[in-house]
Amino acid sequence: SPEPGAPSRSRARREPPPGNELPRGPGESRAGPAARPPEPTAERAHSVDPRDAWMLFVRQSDKGVNGKKRSRGKAKKLKFGLPGPPGPPGPQGPPGPIIPPEALLKEFQLLLKGAVRQRERAEPEPCTCGPAGPVAASLAPVSATAGEDDDDVVGDVLALLAAPLAPGPRAPRVEAAFLCRLRRDALVERRALHELGVYYLPDAEGAFRRGPGLNLTSGQYRAPVAGFYALAATLHVALGEPPRRGPPRPRDHLRLLICIQSRCQRNASLEAIMGLESSSELFTISVNGVLYLQMGQWTSVFLDNASGCSLTVRSGSHFSAVLLGV
């Protein structure tokens, strides 16, 4: 008889057939699982209270242009030893200059600009997703230039400002991902190739689904955008009765595949092979890796039962994917 067939190329794109959402898992409401990762928002990331920042600056305003002593040359590291006895009170100093708020604001902007520069030096590529981009843009008109002294004096202010402003590159938003489980047991006859389908979205903490493309009924995940996808499948397998009740032969094995367009050899695929000669009646087989999918290409999970006995893939076995990047 013919071999269980092959893989392929890019195809005519069509919308997935109906059934993209159904069936739902046990106890899952129409609105979908309750536990879902929150959508990241720009507002929530790196929030710095403007008033707190300003007040800190004003409290530190005896430094910088208001400093009693302008440091020259390199910044000196502060060394803290044992405190000495209190000295005599010094003479009354001359009244300090009245610094108008505009000047304070200008220096505050300079400090912010320095923080942004520090962030840019620390990052190999500028990050456009965080708030630093807009801040830097808004500071562009400031005409004063910060000298070396300013860099030295404002270390503690920078420490406060640079931390929320430049925590390093933000993790990118995941645009496409899912975790689904097999709804019911699937029987796989001996010497047969079986494509898994009929999944559900678990209503559980940590489960996720983001973006379109997953057809729960067909078991096919159609890439919503072209890119690198991390894919994984874990099957819980129960061995059935072998014919003539013989033990598994040394050549008996299972192949678990995640394939593109139902073409496991012609296209790149992920594959795990497991010998059955020493396996127990219930075991797990897993495969994971990364595939590049064109937009509209689909992937699905296949189990090739190259053994002499039938087996059952248990419900709860799972299939997942995450778009890593484009």
């Epitope: 269980p4 067939g5 392929s8 997935p16 057939p17």
Partner: antibody
């Protein structure tokens, strides 16, 4: 038994249409690509197109666009090719063939349907 | 589209003779398949993935090649091998067949 069943022959009038069937049995019809090929008497094989029963995706040979339409009925495990505006050039044997999944190429062929276009 | 040229169009061989059928592609292909078709019957998968024998194909058959040049070889031809052999490429749409080589046994 894994097989593809096709009617033996059909006679049609010029200008008419005909829908050829290919009934699959012995395997999971929806998982495999189904292809159609044409062979004129004494000549070679021409690939018409392919359809995936589960996804509904199709690809055609440009030469047969407007001539051949591929469809499936998953409830009866049957693939169809609809040939329109028939002329004598369409007189040929039409084969359905299953593409393998873990190998490359057609791993199973139907016996073919002979289409005769004649008035 | 990729054009496949088979040669010779007709070949006559005596039993026990070694026979090589060739298939030349107009541009490079990754996989070449061969199908066998006997008169009045449907094609059968014969060699796939360039060199793998389909189930039931005698070991005297072999396939090889890469790029634009592929071949099917019968180490010691037998009477039952009389048929037309087509090469077919799977690298790009539309999938194309060669014109076929008709093998006759003397």
């Amino acid at each position: 038994q894994v097989q593809l069943q096709q009617p033996g022959s059909v006679l049609v009038r010029p200008g008419a249409s005909v829908k050829l069937s290919c009934k699959a049995s012995g395997y999971t019809f929806t998982s495999y690509w189904m292809h159609w090929a044409k062979q004129r008497p004494g000549q070679g094989l021409e690939w018409i197109g392919e359809i995936h029963p589960k996804s509904g995706d199709t690809n055609h040979n440009e030469k047969f666009k407007g001539k051949a339409t591929l469809t499936v009925d998953t409830s009866s495990n049957t693939a169809y090719v609809d040939l329109s505006s028939l002329t004598s050039e369409d007189s040929a044997v039409y084969y359905c063939a299953r593409e393998g999944i873990t190998t490359v190429g057609f791993d199973l062929w139907g016996a073919g349907t002979t289409v005769t276009v004649s008035s | 589209q990729i054009v496949l040229t088979q040669s010779p169009a007709i070949m006559s061989a005596s039993p026990g003779q070694k026979v090589t059928l060739t298939c030349s592609a107009s541009s490079s292909v990754s996989y070449m398949n061969w199908v066998q078709q006997k008169s009045g019957t449907s094609p059968k998968r014969w060699i796939y993935d360039t060199s793998k024998l389909a189930s039931g194909v005698p070991a005297r058959f072999s396939g090889s090649g890469s790029g634009t040049s592929y071949s099917l070889t019968i180490s010691s031809v037998e009477a039952e091998d009389a048929a037309t052999y087509y090469c077919q490429q799977w690298s790009s749409h539309p999938y194309t067949f060669g014109g076929g080589t008709k093998l006759e046994i003397k």
